[in-house]
């Protein structure tokens, strides 16, 4: 067990051009606060995955009012550290998200308004018990400077907080091979009792003989990197025996979600949707207040009006659930037009447009005919994201470069015979029909139903179609 501690040093405009406008104004004074979310391991986890190592919310900073005409300075910060307690071993590698929030203190109806100013994230290696590590992260035009460390809570010691200290049995010194427990010099390190051979980097124990593996490692001695490449099934959970995601019972079998939570399968394992008042991987954490930082993905926590609803999470766009833990499938609304492919990137929607279309939602039809030439007197027609040529008589193909066979489409009706002609085609009509395409029946009395044949042509003679 131990505590991860985060100290924010400054939050203000980053170097370079384009300094951000101050988030506060004389009309709208505001103050900052911060939220940190920790996850074990170095894996690229989605932003909405739970803060499995823990989360914390800072106090509010001093009220700040912008001085007219002055550039945005470093903004006044809350006092104190953000502390995230962890109950089990410190994993050594972790991912973090630090969010900077603005609380506007104007005349909003219904209390202050909150908005997310910046979010930074990273993945780091850190041994417990080590010195403060300094970091600088940029989010847009903003820059966040901070330090962090992990420290063990007595009696735990060591880089993973898994070794234990015991009061000295003798007043003067520790037993053979055992060191004093700095900084608790009056105590001694308990002997290491993990399984013989257990990897000191990737394994730890809480009971004699154990060798429990940190995330990403497996095998009897935690010496084997977990690899899913040789696994046949994507279905979990992770097996200590193989280091693979192995086929087996569904992750929701037996409903692992406590306190009335509902279980749904995910590609990697399962996800619990918790009733209000509970959170955690299995909805096992209760009695939660806003101080516990239960709202994920930038959700804003507000104290509930009664004991049964100790907090309410106001979710940012794109997230839902009692703890803002679920991402809304915004692509289901089919925002991309003209057949564009929708991509939900979490922080934004993107549309990948088909050829001939552009714009944030593929709403602009590009000029398909720009720079396109149709040969042999053809004219370009836009449409469908690809240009099309309407060809002059006797020509065809994509660009009207091919000489067309005018008889290929069998243009002569009622059994008329087609003859190619230098200026088009000629139909020789079967008895009883006339017209350029032999489309008109000849009346039995010799009169036609439509205008008479031109002078010099008898019904049944070939009709030249111009």
């Amino acid at each position: 067990a131990g505590v991860f501690e985060l100290q924010i040093h400054s939050f203000g405009p980053g170097p370079g051009p384009g300094a951000p406008r101050s988030p506060c104004s004389a009309r709208l004074p505001c103050r900052l606060f911060f939220r940190v979310c920790l996850k074990p391991g170095l894996s690229e986890e989605a932003a909405e995955s739970p803060c499995a190592l823990g989360a914390a919310l800072s106090a509010r900073g001093p009220v700040y009012t912008e001085q007219p005409g002055a550039p945005a300075p470093d903004l006044p910060l809350p006092d104190g550290l953000l502390q995230v307690p962890f109950r089990d071993a410190w994993p050594g590698t972790f991912s973090f998200i630090i969010e900077t929030w603005r609380e506007e203190l104007g005349d909003q109806i219904g209390g202050p308004a909150w908005s997310l100013l910046a979010r930074v994230a990273g993945r780091r290696r850190l041994a417990a018990g080590g010195p403060w590590a300094r970091d600088i992260q940029r989010a847009g035009a903003w820059e966040l400077r901070f330090s962090y460390r992990a420290r063990c809570e007595p009696p735990a010691v060591g880089t993973a907080c898994t070794r234990l200290c015991r009061p000295r049995s003798a007043p003067s010194r520790c037993g053979p091979g055992l060191r004093p427990c700095a900084p608790l010099e009056d105590e001694c390190e308990a002997p290491l009792v993990c399984r013989a051979g257990c990897s000191p980097e990737h394994g730890f124990c809480e009971q004699p003989g154990e060798c429990r593996c940190l995330e990403g490692w497996t095998g009897p001695l935690c010496t084997v990197p977990v690899s899913t490449s040789s696994c046949l099934s994507p279905r979990g959970p992770s097996s200590a025996t193989t280091g693979c995601l192995v086929p087996g019972p569904g992750p929701c079998d037996g409903n692992p979600c406590a306190n009335g939570g509902s279980c749904s399968e995910t590609p990697r394992s399962f996800e619990c949707t918790c009733p209000r008042g509970f959170y955690g991987l299995r909805c096992e954490v209760s009695g939660v207040t806003c101080a516990d930082g239960p709202c994920f993905n930038g959700g804003l926590c507000v104290g509930g009006a009664d004991p049964d609803s100790a907090y309410i999470c106001h979710c940012p766009p794109g997230f839902q659930g009692s703890n803002c833990e679920k991402r809304v499938d915004r692509c289901s609304l089919q925002p991309c037009r003209n057949g564009g492919l929708c991509l939900d990137l979490g922080h934004a929607l993107r549309c990948r447009c088909r050829a001939g279309f552009a714009g944030p939602r593929c709403e602009h039809d590009l000029d398909d005919c720009a720079g396109r030439a149709c040969a042999n007197g053809g004219t370009c027609v836009e449409g469908g994201g690809a240009h099309r040529c309407s060809c002059a008589l006797g020509f065809g193909g994509r660009d009207c470069r091919e000489r067309a066979d005018p008889c290929a489409a069998r243009p002569c009706a009622h059994g008329g015979r087609c003859y190619a002609h230098f200026s088009g085609l000629v139909c020789a009509c079967a008895p009883g029909y006339m017209g350029a395409r032999c489309e008109f029946p000849v009346h039995p009395d010799g009169a036609s139903a439509l205008p008479a044949a031109p002078p010099g042509l008898r019904p049944g003679d070939p009709q030249r179609y111009l």
Partner: antibody, heavy 119, light 107 residues
């Protein structure tokens, strides 16, 4: 000194179950894994699985899941392996062994229990 | 599973000779290989662990070498009590697996 004493020869009928025992002396039983190994003529040695008596944690070879079940009784310093639905394929010598305290291997072995399954 | 191929299966030698037994793993097992001796009427004995570490009480004529996939047990200046069956075992990955054994017989 460390010793692992296994139960005696067993003659069982097909379909029956049998519980083999392994009594440990000379060390703190709860802190070392007890390993179970099968030996059949022509098949060499096969790892069945292991149990950590202090926590009851187990690891099984997939091949023996459903066949073998490990338990341990710290009060009597004894580990057990139950084999169910016996067939003639289960006829073998079964060994228990201890994963060392400082040695990364099996530093002590039992003498073995011979199991014969025959109708 | 990690397959362990042990060779030779049989080996005939005389006291005073030096012999080698090889084990090859189907993939890297780092240094995590042990060698055991089996003799009738006796409990199995650990000789070498972690590829090359001699277990306490084992004579220095036994030695182990190798890492990754290829390992060797060498017995120099064979003694009469060394004629037995020898097994290697990997314990880097579950399931733990053994080689098929080498029977060392008196020539």
């Amino acid at each position: 000194q460390v010793q692992l004493q296994q139960s005696g020869t067993e003659l069982m009928k097909p379909g029956a179950s049998v519980k083999l025992s392994c009594k440990a002396t000379g060390y703190t039983f709860t802190g070392n894994w007890i390993e179970w190994v099968k030996q059949r003529p022509g098949h060499g040695l096969e790892w069945i699985g292991e149990i950590l008596p202090g926590t009851g944690s187990t690891q099984y070879n997939e091949k023996f899941k459903g066949k073998a079940t490990f338990t341990a009784d710290p009060s009597s310093n004894t580990a057990y392996m139950q084999l169910s639905s016996l067939t003639t394929e289960d006829s073998a010598i079964y060994y228990c062994a201890r994963w060392g305290s400082t040695v990364v291997a099996y530093d002590y072995w039992g003498q073995g229990t011979t199991l014969t399954v025959s109708s | 599973d990690v397959q362990i191929t042990q060779s030779p299966s049989y080996l005939a030698a005389s006291p005073g000779e030096t012999i080698t037994i090889n084990c090859r793993a189907s993939k890297s097992i780092s240094k995590y290989l042990a060698w055991y001796q089996e003799k009738p009427g006796k409990t199995n004995k650990l000789l070498i662990y972690s590829g090359s570490t001699l277990h306490s009480g084992i004579p220095s004529r036994f030695s182990g070498s190798g890492s990754g996939t290829d390992f060797t047990l060498t017995i120099s200046s064979l003694e009469p009590e060394d004629f037995a069956i020898y097994y290697c075992q990997q314990h880097n990955e579950y399931p733990l697996t053994f080689g098929g054994g080498t029977k060392l017989e008196l020539k």
